[in-house]
Each structure stands twice: as C-alpha cells, then as structure tokens.
Interface confidence: low
C-alpha cells in the first residue's frame, strides 16, 4: 500500500524518495511517473535520471534534493487539486526486475487561506537542503542543485513556523529508501 | 537560437557598486540556472554563484559572498549580478553562463562584460 | 574548495598535430570534469563534460579521457580554429572551479 502524502493548493508538494548509490558519480537511473508503478518503466514520466544527470524533467517537476547521493525526492511546484493521486518513484537498478518500486499518494486540500508564493518557495526549497544534509557531510561540500544558502538558525526558525502545519508533516523523514551495493 | 547578450564594458569608480545584466533568448528562461564566472587579466576562471530562476534560489562561492549579488527578471529573461565596495581587485570580464538543471556544465556563455575599477 | 590543475599554461604545435592537454583535481571528481575553449576574443564554448561526452556541433577530433583525479583533453587534428585557450572545469563539488588554461599557440 502506498504511503500517503499530503499538500494545500498552491503550496509546493514534496514526495520523498532515496537510494544509496554503490559508488560515488555511479548512479542509477531514475524515473517519477504519474499513477502506480507499472511492471516496467513509469507511466506518464514527470521527470526522469541517468547515470549522470536529470535528462528530463516537466514543468513544475523537480529534484531540489542532492540527486548524486541518492535525494530523488520529487517536489511538484504550485499544485492544485488535478495534482491528487499517485506518483511513482522507481529506482532502475541494473538486471531483470531487479527495479525498486514505491508507490506514493498525494492528497491535495484546498487551501485555507491565501498561500503566499515566495514564502512558500523560501521553505519549499529549503527543507530538502536540511533532509538531504544527513549523511551527506558539511553543507559546503553538497553538490549542485541551486539551492539556497540556509544555516542551522535558520532550519530551527523554518521548522518551528512550519512545526503544526500540513507541509511539516509530510517532511517527516519516512520516505521511500533502498541501498544498493 | 540561445543567446546571452552582455553590455561590453563598464567604467565605475572605487567604493561605488555596479549592476552588470544578462538577457537570454531562445530557450524557456525559468528552465535553466544562470551562472556568473569572474576572469582576471585574461586568466582563469573563477565560479561566483547561480541563481535559479523557477525558485529564485541561490547558490554563492563562499568567496564572492557580500561582494556579488544575483537577482533575475523572469517578466524580461534577464539576469543581474550587482558587485558592490567596488576595489580595483574586482576589475575584470564576468561572464553570465547557462547551466541546465541538474548539470554541472555551462552550455552556452554570454559575450562577457569588461569591468574597469578606477578612479 | 576542490583545486584544477593545469600543468602547462602553454603549449606550441603545429597544424596537423595531436595535441593532449592535461587537469589534474586535488582529490577524486567521480569523472565531473568539463572542457571549455576560450578563444582570443574571449568567447567561451564548452567542448566537452562529463569527462568524455562530446558536446553537440563540436567537432570529433577532439576527445575527453580520465578518471580519478587525472583527465586530458585530446585535440587529434590540429586545427586553425583550435587556437585558443582550454579550460577545465569541476563540477563534482560545490563551489565550481576552473585549472588556470592551457594556451594552445602555433609553432
């Protein structure tokens, strides 16, 4: 059964999903469709890695996560209701049926009040910095992903705003995890 | 056809700040990071920061920080770079360079813009 | 930060020539290692990224290889047009960073 994942309209949605790569620059493809995991492949791909890079993405479909250490975490910027559903994350390990497949649902509300858009982003952005940060060594040494300069006050701050909202809680850290190698 | 279109040069006294723009054309703007490159005298190549337009989200060379800021205008395509305590240290060509999502790699460089500090 | 070393800041050869030019990065980059071409006029294209990968319209003779810490930029046909100054680049690890180049001159 898919774990449930929750999200206001116009808010951006967050989708956790990670692997742990065998080596470091050895990745594993990647592919986030829309609707449940099919035998093979995914089905209407949002986004999709190879060995190296995202090589394709669609509008408001991103990794804001360290995607070269495993963080294949999908956000889906400003969503509306049309957005609910299930999303499928699949991890394209090497050989036959050997992929990893998590299936995870997303349950958009509508928003109870007028969200505001760049603050919204402000946090959106920087709590997969803060998720994705675990393990990964001190935050100068992250790879690329253009995300924002954030320090710990500032996660404390964010969290307490965010401590009784919807969007901490589906932050918590139960997403969908698998080590290869 | 993807262009970077860059002032030629910029005269500005010591002490005073300049804003240096970038616009781009041919692609879909909010797709792609627009990174800032700092080239001394004609050698090597320093890293300044990106800015990602789609989030307005940053990252800066901890070198650079205080001294560069980057901003875009989604509305024009064009992106900003503001150096400000202008010294003669800053006297340079900086370059605006597209880097695609999830890349490590500038695909396309703007002409670059020669910027002298001086009195 | 991650330091780019490019041993030789200049090179002279003749048109014709297969030329190699050598980076070296202060520890491994996992094979994020990118390839520019500066000409005089100070136009900046990428030749190649991740180590090997031949960026679209540039031409074949030239070739990326290495691992580790240890990769070359390999010109097999020396070209008028190839007289420029080549960047490496490593996109391994925040903050990005560049070698010094290698000036590419005629003989």
């Known amino acids: 059964s898919e774990v449930e994942y929750r999200a206001e309209v116009g808010q951006n949605a967050y989708l956790p999903c990670f692997y742990t790569p065998a080596a470091p620059g050895n990745l594993v493809p990647v592919c986030w469709g829309k609707g449940a995991c099919p035998v093979f492949e995914c089905g209407n791909v949002v986004l999709r890695t190879d060995e190296r890079d995202v090589n394709y993405w669609t509008s408001r479909y991103w990794l804001n996560g360290d995607f070269r250490k495993g963080d294949v975490s999908l956000t889906i910027e400003n969503v509306t209701l049309a957005d609910s559903g299930i999303y499928c994350c699949r991890i394209q390990i090497p050989g036959i049926m050997n992929d990893e497949k998590f299936n995870l649902k997303l349950v958009i509300k509508p928003a109870k009040v007028t969200p505001a858009p760049t603050r919204q982003r402000d946090f959106t952005a920087a709590f997969p910095r803060m998720l994705t940060t675990r393990g990964h060594g001190p935050a100068e040494t992250q790879t690329l992903g253009s995300l924002p300069d954030i320090n710990l006050t500032q996660i404390s701050t964010l969290a307490n705003e965010l401590r009784d909202s919807r969007l901490a809680n589906d932050l918590r850290d139960s997403g969908a995890t698998i080590r290869i190698g | 056809e993807v262009q970077l279109q860059q002032l030629g040069a910029e005269l500005v006294k010591p002490g005073a700040s300049v804003k240096i723009s970038c616009k781009a054309s041919?692609?879909?703007?909010?797709?792609?990071?627009m990174d800032w490159v700092k080239q001394s005298h004609g050698e090597s190549l320093e890293w300044i920061g990106d800015i990602n337009p789609n989030y307005d989200s940053l990252s800066y060379n901890q070198k650079f920080k205080g001294k560069a800021t980057l901003t875009v205008d989604k509305s024009s395509s064009t992106a900003y770079m503001e150096l400000r305590s202008l010294t003669s240290e800053d006297t340079a060509v900086y370059y605006c360079?597209?880097?695609?999502?999830?890349?490590?790699?500038?695909?396309?460089w703007g002409q670059g813009t020669s910027l002298t500090v001086s009195s | 930060t991650w330091g780019m070393t490019q041993t030789t800041s200049s090179l002279s050869a003749s048109l014709g020539d297969r030329v190699t030019i050598s980076c070296r990065a202060s520890q491994d980059i996992s094979n994020y290692l990118n390839w520019y071409q500066q000409k005089p006029d100070g136009t900046v294209k990428l030749l190649i990224y991740h180590t090997s990968r031949l960026y679209s319209g540039v031409p074949s003779r030239f070739t990326g290889s290495g691992s580790g810490t240890d990769y070359s930029l390999t010109i097999s046909n020396l070209e008028q047009e190839d007289i420029a100054t080549y960047f490496c680049?490593?996109?391994?690890?925040?903050?990005?960073?560049f070698g010094a180049g290698t000036k590419l001159e005629l003989k």
């Open positions: 360079a597209r880097r695609g999502y999830g890349k490590d790699y500038f695909d396309f």
């Open positions: 680049q490593q996109g391994n690890t925040l903050p990005l960073t």
């Open positions: 041919g692609y879909i703007f909010t797709d792609y990071s």
